[in-house]
Interface confidence: low
């Protein structure tokens, strides 16, 4: 069990999404509509995991990690590639260890095999990511 | 109830290719993935590859790659793998499971993958001259 | 061989409790979680415990699993002779990008 003073997360999970992150934690009730908070029963460290695909970056998951582990030392959500579900789109992830830090993200690095989207750094959207 | 229901014992020669199919009954099969596993006799699990039947993305292991190829049907809720170029070291069960990662093709859970929960009943495959 | 590390053995008598252990690397168990299953021997796998330490519907809450860093454990207590199988752990591994099994721990109920 975490510490009492819990780490709170932003959670969400796209439609379609199996298998649920939410036992990771305890809902916190933000008003309607997302985003929603998750305080996190078993680490310090949120995640947040997002699609990005032909330019645009679409959040997939939000939430709590189960256990402390590398990465969530970072005040941030820097994501990284890690895998790639098609040859036109790559999922990016972060972890970061403060409240609400994975929200969003300042800036997707190159994605590898990505094809190339155009001539800027790809970005959610002005304000952040597209939620579904 | 949820089932998977594998296609049946197969001998084959060294070089020849081998196709199983694996149907699914009791769920809408577009909502998940299916993986395919073998074991070789009296060893361990091996994971061969997965398909999202949703949208036909695959992921295969990297020793079978070029060698192996998933597909899906989803007229007839039925999954297949063949595998080319058979060796004598192929002989195994070849197993089919649902898979708990998403059928939507969002990918991998991740940090958060549920495994696998519905398994066939396997189909031997012997390759022998 | 396995990536993943398991004892190929492990014996108790019924009522007992037994741990099984996996042992991985910082590409898999310590950055994914992990799954274990259960074979019976002529038998396709079950599985037993998803995300570390969850139970499907229909396991006995006497099989429970953990997680710490980049090794995992599977607890069986009070065993009974039907758990007499083969026991598998699993992860994601992100260097492979695919998914690994441990080679399996035959677990033997005496008496």
């Known amino acids: 069990q975490v510490s009492p003073n819990r780490r709170t997360c932003v959670f969400f999970e796209a439609p379609g999404v199996r298998g649920s992150t939410k036992t990771l934690g305890e809902m916190v009730d933000a008003g309607p509509g997302p985003p929603k908070g998750i305080r996190c029963l078993y680490s310090h460290c949120c995640f947040g995991i997002w699609n990005l695909t032909h330019g645009r970056a679409q959040v997939e998951m939000q939430g709590c990690r189960d256990s402390d582990e590398p990465g969530c030392e970072s005040l941030h959500c820097d994501p990284v590639p890690r895998a790639h579900p098609n040859p036109s789109s790559t999922l990016f992830t972060c972890s970061c260890g403060t409240d609400f830090c994975n929200a969003n993200y300042s800036h997707l690095p190159p994605s590898g095999n990505q094809g190339a989207p155009g001539p800027q750094e790809p970005q959610a959207t002005p304000g952040g990511p597209v939620w579904m | 109830q949820v089932q998977l229901v594998q296609s049946g014992t197969e001998v084959k020669r060294p070089g020849a290719s081998v196709k199983i199919s694996c149907r699914a009954t009791g769920y809408t099969f577009s909502d998940y993935g299916i993986s395919w596993m073998r074991q070789a006799p009296g060893q361990g699990l091996e994971w061969m590859g997965w398909?999202?039947?949703?949208?036909?993305?695959?992921n295969y292991a990297q020793k079978l790659q070029g060698r192996v190829t998933m597909t899906t049907d989803t007229s007839t809720s039925t999954a297949y793998m063949e595998l080319r170029s058979l060796r004598y070291d192929d002989t195994a069960v070849y197993y089919c499971a649902r898979d708990g990662r998403r059928g939507s093709g969002i990918y991998w859970g991740v940090y958060y993958y549920n495994g696998m929960d519905v398994w066939g009943q396997g189909t031997t495959v012997t390759v022998s001259s | 061989q396995p990536v993943l590390t398991q004892p190929p053995s492990a014996s108790g008598t019924p009522g007992q409790r037994v741990t099984i252990s996996c042992s991985g690397s910082?590409?898999?168990?310590?950055?994914?979680?992990v799954n274990w299953y259960q074979q019976v021997p002529g038998m396709a796998p079950k599985l037993l415990i998803y995300s570390n330490n969850q139970r499907p519907s229909g396991v006995p809450d006497r099989f429970s699993g953990s997680k710490s860093g980049t090794s995992a454990s599977l607890a069986i207590s009070g065993l009974q002779s039907e758990d007499e199988a083969d026991y598998y752990c699993?992860?994601?591994?992100?260097?492979?990008?695919?998914?690994?099994f441990g080679g399996g721990t035959k677990l033997t109920v005496l008496g």
């Open positions: 699993a992860a994601w591994d992100d260097s492979l990008n695919g998914v690994v």
């Open positions: 910082r590409s898999n168990i310590g950055r994914n979680t």
């Open positions: 398909i999202s039947a949703y949208n036909g993305n695959t």
